[in-house]
Structures are given as structure tokens and as C-alpha cells.
């Protein structure tokens, strides 16, 4: 049995619905019945969506239950527990998850234009440095003239010397696209920010 946290973007965007997910694997087709119970701070809740078991390539079954949660419950450190009952288990299996402890610190965000030396290439790199944040859960994306872009890569959050985290995000664009004066925006979601959001632009 595995329990997974909600997606960072879902937790930090008020209009999305974060979900804690419980997954049971290696269920025998001879005893496929699995029952999920969910608890928030040890109080049972009944709002989970449990999907029909799915057959896997190794002939076992996989069962998934998703609990939609309130953003604040996750961010305020409540504990989410998934309890799984099955005839195949000698006793119910419980798995719990909550947000890592510690005081949130919002990131500083800096954007950097392509280096002069790179302008000889047909593709250039626009860089976003995101530093000084805690916890490491963060969502970073790029927009051009307000439109989401896909041609970017983020480094994983890395611990800095002061215990906070940093990352770099690199957007690749055609040199002509950069030279045309388009506006490029590095957009960051983190719980330490006002409304969880900040962005920095350059053109």
C-alpha cells in the first residue's frame, strides 16, 4: 500500500482540487476485494473516490482511492490516513501522510537573458533562478506574452547552505523569438508567497 501527496500545483492554486492518493498493488485476482477508509487527523471522512481495480500486465490488480482535500488542511499540516482492508491481509494496513514541518519561506525569483556568447546559436536560453524557499514543494513554469510554454526544464529543488532550497528553470526559444521583443515570464507557485504566486518577466 502506498500513499501519495497532492500535486503541488493543485495545493497552491485555489481553483484546483488537491487529492491525496492511496494505491494498493499486487492484488490477487482470486481475492480482489479491497476496502478503503480515510481519516483526517483521525476523524473518518467519506468523500473519497475509489476507482474500480485495474488489471496489470503481471495479471495482478491495482486499486486506487483518491481523497479530495481542502487546500488549508494540507497546508496547515493535518494528517491524512488511508486504511486498507482486504481478505488477503492478516490485518488492515494503514498509511499516513502530511506536509513536511517547518516555517514556510517564499522564494526570490530572478530572470536572466540569454548570455551574449549564446547568441551565435539558433536556440537561446532564458533562465529563471528561484532561491531561498522552504519547503521544497514548488511549481515553476514559463509564459510568453501570457501564453504557457512547454520547451523548458527545471532542475530539482536543491538544498542551499542555509537550509533553504533553490532551483533553476531554463526556457529554450528560437533566437528570432527572443530578438522580436516578446515578453517572457517565469511564474512560480510556493506556499510562502502571498496568494502562493509570483512572477518575473523580461524581454
Amino acid at each position: 500500500v502506498f500513499i501519495f501527496p497532492p500535486k503541488t500545483k493543485d495545493v497552491l492554486t485555489i481553483t484546483l482540487t488537491p487529492k491525496v492518493t492511496c494505491v494498493v498493488v499486487d492484488i490477487s485476482q482470486n481475492d480482489p476485494e479491497v476496502r478503503f477508509s480515510w481519516f483526517i487527523d483521525d476523524v473518518e471522512v467519506h468523500t473519497a473516490q475509489t476507482h474500480a481495480p485495474e488489471k496489470q500486465s503481471n495479471s495482478t490488480l491495482r486499486s486506487v482511492s483518491e481523497l479530495p482535500i481542502v487546500h488549508r488542511d494540507w497546508l496547515n499540516g493535518k494528517t491524512f490516513k488511508c486504511k486498507v482492508n482486504s481478505g488477503a491481509f492478516p490485518a488492515p494496513i494503514e498509511k499516513s501522510i502530511s506536509k513536511p514541518e517547518g516555517t514556510p519561506r517564499g522564494p526570490q525569483v530572478y530572470t536572466m537573458a540569454p548570455p551574449k556568447e549564446e547568441m551565435t546559436q539558433s536556440q537561446v536560453s532564458i533562465t529563471c533562478m528561484v532561491k531561498g524557499f522552504y519547503p521544497p514543494d514548488i511549481y515553476t513554469e514559463w509564459k510568453m506574452n501570457g501564453q504557457p510554454q512547454e520547451n523548458y526544464k527545471n532542475t530539482p529543488p536543491t538544498m542551499d547552505t542555509d537550509g533553504s532550497y533553490f532551483l533553476y528553470s531554463k526556457l529554450n526559444v528560437k533566437k528570432e523569438t527572443w530578438q522580436q521583443g516578446n515578453t517572457f515570464t517565469c511564474s512560480v507557485l510556493h506556499e510562502g508567497l502571498h496568494n502562493h504566486h509570483t512572477e518575473k518577466s523580461l524581454s
Epitope: I14, T15, H71, H194, N195, H196
Partner: antibody, heavy 117, light 107 residues
């Protein structure tokens, strides 16, 4: 730059309805709720409710449940509040406000509604 | 509904003076409290969120404090542009509710 642009003043007769638009720009419309607030001389500021533009879900202050209907037109980034069965008590300034995890960081300029025969 | 009682309802203060406005909730609101400033003919502007966090661009002379049911907004040294009406708002429970406002005028 985040902007919420509301329509100009409205003068309507008792018993009629009115639909107030709020045009959003400068951010991703579906990433924030749109809240609506009433400001009258008698009752200061009152929260009417909000709409989630991503899902269309709404939450209303029970005091306004039979008075207001919140909708959005996603493709145009416009939120609407319709007020029905208007009386003189509905005379007020109505604001839209962008609602994130932290309340109301940007507000519209307000629409003045006057209900009078 | 949670009732937000703001005091005083109006006050006069001198330039450079330290000013404190309070807001009391009818129950614990878990620090989900914001403060707004409104000038005549303008829409409200957020100053403080989650009881004590200053919005970017708001002068550092503004500060918020409090927890549980009791909260306050302090202006450390009053400036002319600070006159207006100040409102608190609880964002802990629906329906969200505002305080009745404090009208701050310069002596």
C-alpha cells in the same frame, strides 16, 4: 498588470434585474476565484459569494442566496453577478475582487447600483 | 456567522503618532484575518493578510498582529496619506465577514 474592470453606474426600477460584468486581465483567469462584495451606507462591506472560474462552482453568503447569481464566461475572462427582484435595499456599490488563497488582493473599481422608481 | 467587532469606529490622530485599530472575532479565526484600507470613492486595498503578513508594496509602518479572536492593525508613525477607512475581514469560515470599519482622520 492585474486589472478588474467593472461597468458604469446602473439605475434600475424596483422588481427588475441587473447583470454586472467584471472583465479580468493580466493573469490566468481560471487560477483565481472571483469574489463579489456589496458596500452600502447601512451595512458597510458584505461578502456576497464567489465563483470558481475553473470549475464553475459557487459559494454564496446565505443572505444573498436568493438575490445573486454568479456566472463566468471563461473564453472572454468575464465574471458576472446578476441581482434579481431589486428593491431600494439593493442600492449600493458592488465590487468584484480576485480571490486567491489569501483574500482579495485586487479589486474592481466598483459598480454603483441605484434602485429607484 | 462570525461577527467581527472593530474599534474604534472613528478616530482622530496626529501626524507621526502611533495608531492602533482592533478587531475582535466572535470565535477563533485561526489568524485568517486581512486588513484593508479604503479611501473616498476608491475600492479597498489589501494591507495585511493572515493577520501579520504585509502585502508587497505596502509601507513598513503598517503591521498586523494577533491570534485566536483578537487582532490589531498598527501604523507606527501616521502619515497624511494614511487617512481613510480601515476594515478587517475574517477568511476562516463562510460566509466571510467584515468589521464595521474604522474611520481614521488627521487631527
Amino acid at each position: 498588470e492585474v486589472q478588474l474592470l467593472q461597468s458604469g453606474p446602473e439605475l434600475v426600477k424596483p422588481g427588475a434585474s441587473v447583470k454586472i460584468p467584471c472583465k479580468a486581465s493580466g493573469y490566468t483567469f481560471t487560477d483565481y476565484n472571483m469574489d463579489w462584495v456589496k458596500q452600502s451606507h447601512e451595512k458597510s462591506l458584505e461578502w456576497i459569494g464567489y465563483i470558481n472560474p475553473y470549475s464553475g462552482d459557487t459559494i454564496y453568503n446565505h443572505k444573498f442566496k436568493d438575490k445573486a447569481t454568479l456566472t463566468v464566461y471563461k473564453s472572454s475572462n468575464i465574471a458576472y453577478m446578476e441581482l434579481r427582484s431589486l428593491t431600494s435595499e439593493d442600492t449600493a456599490v458592488y465590487y468584484c475582487a480576485r480571490g486567491g488563497y489569501d483574500y482579495g488582493d485586487h479589486w474592481g473599481q466598483g459598480t454603483t447600483l441605484t434602485v429607484s422608481s | 456567522d462570525i461577527k467581527m467587532t472593530q474599534s474604534p469606529s472613528s478616530m482622530y490622530a496626529s501626524l507621526g503618532e502611533r495608531v492602533t485599530i482592533t478587531c475582535k472575532a466572535s470565535q477563533d479565526i485561526n489568524s485568517y484575518l486581512s486588513w484593508f484600507q479604503q479611501k473616498p470613492g476608491k475600492s479597498p486595498k489589501t494591507l495585511i493578510y493572515r493577520a501579520n503578513r504585509l502585502v508587497d508594496g505596502v509601507p513598513s509602518r503598517f503591521s498586523g498582529s494577533g491570534s485566536g479572536q483578537d487582532y490589531s492593525l498598527t501604523i507606527s508613525s501616521l502619515e497624511y496619506e494614511d487617512m481613510g477607512i480601515y476594515y478587517c475581514l475574517q477568511d476562516d469560515e463562510f460566509p466571510r465577514t467584515f468589521g464595521g470599519g474604522t474611520k481614521l482622520e488627521i487631527k
